[in-house]
């Protein structure tokens, strides 16, 4: 339980934290597990202990092995183990799995890729970022503090991202690289209280007596698959089918999915041969889903024919 795997590349800095935690005032002793030999604390050594941290400046393949740390307090001792593996640098671009840190996934709304282990090091901005070994260029990529932000994430942004920074120790600089995979997941769907785009609330629609008229009820319900979303018309609070006027029918419009991903529905009310009595009716556009029901009311008014005066 109190053993931690750490890895690094030869000739790079590697800093490892003791898996057992303690107050800053507690002393921490480090040992080579195989030999039980104490690790020096003097900074002139290439490998030295500094409290909870074990520093390889720089690391060598021969440093691979298990290191023991003992956190000592006045009342107890706690032991932890750091399993360190130092690998030779690869000549090609591929980063092998054993050098990869945990995969992170991002989406349209959240596309931060944190540079792994960076908080252990004494580094200064800027951080350099590479994707599949290529330096990232373009305004979509922003190195911000210890993470990379990608604007307008797309599925093509998935891949292996490497951060590179310089660790400074007593005026000496050491390079560090760390790589992790980034996957892109589709933003999950969501649903909203229905939003009626048309008609406007209490809209007055001008119609001509004897002509046909169309009213469209259009509403959006969220993004992705929508459960039990519906739009419909009512006449004087009654369903069209129950109203019993064959001249007035509703017809499902197209299911729309706009470029912003919103799921919307249309219902067209068709009135054939508009009559005077149609002007007295209340036309309700209803949009409903599991969140609730929204109603917009429309009334018809007579369109005055244009007078032709000489």
């Amino acid at each position: 339980k109190f053993s931690k795997q750490s890895w690094g590349l030869e000739n790079e800095a590697l800093i490892v934290r003791c898996p057992r935690q303690g107050k800053p005032s507690y002393t921490v002793d480090w040992y080579y597990s195989q030999t039980n030999k104490s690790i020096p604390t003097q900074e002139r050594n290439r490998v030295f202990a500094s409290g909870q941290l074990l520093k390889f400046l720089p690391a060598a393949v021969a440093d691979s092995g298990i290191y023991t740390c003992i956190v000592r307090s006045p009342t107890f001792n706690r032991t932890g183990y750091a399993n360190v593996t130092i690998y030779k640098k690869q000549s090609d671009c591929n980063v092998p799995d054993y050098l990869m840190y945990s995969t992170v996934s991002g989406s349209e709304k959240n596309s931060k890729i944190y540079c792994p282990t960076i908080d252990l090091y004494n580094w200064t901005a800027p951080l350099e970022w590479f994707k599949n070994c290529q330096a990232l260029q373009g305004s979509r990529y922003r190195a911000h503090k210890s993470f990379l932000v990608i604007d307008n994430v797309m599925t093509e942004d998935a891949g292996d991202y490497t951060c590179k920074f310089i660790h400074n120790e007593n005026g000496a600089n050491y390079s560090v690289t760390a790589t992790r995979s980034f996957t892109v997941k589709d933003e999950q769907g969501f649903s909203l209280f229905p939003v009626i785009g048309a008609p406007a609330q209490n809209e007055i629609k001008e119609v001509e007596i004897g002509k046909n008229a169309n009213l469209t009820c259009s509403a959006c319900f969220g993004k992705g698959t929508q459960f039990l979303a519906a739009v419909l018309w009512q006449l004087n609070g009654t369903k069209i089918t129950d109203f019993g006027e064959p001249r007035i029918q509703q017809e499902e419009g197209q299911n729309q999915s706009f470029s912003n991903g919103l799921a919307c529905l249309d219902m067209v009310l068709r009135i054939a041969d508009v009559k005077e009595e149609d002007l007295l009716l209340q036309y309700d556009c209803l949009a409903l889903n599991l969140h609730g029901l929204r109603r917009h009311t429309v009334r018809l008014s007579r369109k005055n024919p244009i007078d032709h005066h000489s």
Epitope: F193, L228, A229, L232, L290, H291, G292, R294, R295, H296
Partner: antibody, heavy 126, light 113 residues
Framework: QVQLVQSGAEVKKPGSSVKVSCKAS????????IHWVRQAPGQGLEWMGI????????TYAQKFQGRVTITADESTSTAYMELSSLRSEDTAVYYC???????????????????WGQGTTVTVSS | DIVMTQSPDSLAVSLGERATINCKSS????????????LAWYQQKPGQPPKLLIY???TRESGVPDRFSGSGSGTDFTLTISSLQAEDVAVYYC?????????FGQGTKVEIK
């Protein structure tokens, strides 16, 4: 007052179907969804599905998909739940429940289940 | 599916004492668009259908005594009966209506000590 009245107890043979009715009164039937929930003896509550009476749209729990059909008859303000291919594990009390709503002139905000039927006991036994 | 987990499974409280039931959802039931928690609490007495007590996590249904209160947000919710009465002996369920399928907690049985 608002109430949901369910049909009486049923005893069914394995493999058969049962249809439970739920008659609503005291409110505008078309404006509220109806849920169906069941409760096996000594067990908790299990949501089966929902119907939107106006459009007749339904959504079912995956577990019951293909075996359950929920319908509504606006003319009688009645919702129905039919469960087919009955097995002994379907022995339970079946409830209909109306979705709760905060109502203003032009909005209904739906929440939970505010009115429940009295329950219909369905026993599946050979 | 969102899994609702209640604790404890049963609870024995003296008359007049406070009873607290917890409910945890496997994912948040807080809708950011309206800042509402889609969570309800029900009371069920033997041989009766459930009765809605609380909705939107903290709004008391009309007619429910004010000794019943709901609190919490996101994934962690609590139903509190401030002063237990004999008629409060029942099984209590939490339920999310954030997404389909709607799901209930397994229930908490409240008894008198």
């Amino acid at each position: 007052q608002v109430q949901l009245v369910q049909s009486g107890a049923e005893v069914k043979k394995p493999g058969s179907s049962v249809k439970v009715s739920c008659k609503a009164s005291g409110y505008r039937f078309t404006d509220y969804y109806i849920h169906w929930v069941r409760q096996a003896p000594g067990q908790g509550l299990e949501w089966m599905g929902i119907i939107q009476p106006t459009g007749g749209g339904t959504t079912y729990a995956q577990k019951f998909q293909g075996r359950v059909t929920i319908t509504a008859d606006e003319s009688t303000s009645t919702a129905y739940m039919e469960l087919s291919s009955l097995r002994s594990e379907d022995t339970a009390v079946y409830y209909c429940a109306r979705v709760g709503a905060t109502v203003t002139k032009n909005y209904y905000y739906y929440y939970g289940m505010d009115v429940w039927g009295q329950g219909t006991t369905v026993t599946v036994s050979s | 599916d969102i899994v609702m987990t209640q604790s404890p499974d049963s609870l024995a409280v003296s008359l007049g004492e406070r009873a607290t039931i917890n409910c945890k959802s496997s994912q948040s039931v807080l809708y950011s668009s309206n800042n509402r928690n889609y969570l309800a609490w029900y009371q069920q007495k033997p041989g009766q259908p459930p009765k809605l007590l609380i909705y939107w996590a903290s709004t008391r249904e009309s007619g429910v005594p004010d000794r019943f209160s709901g609190s919490g947000s996101g994934t962690d919710f609590t139903l509190t009966i401030s002063s237990l009465q004999a008629e409060d002996v029942a099984v209590y369920y939490c339920q999310q209506y954030y997404s389909v399928p709607l799901t209930f907690g397994q229930g908490t049985k409240v008894e008198i000590k």
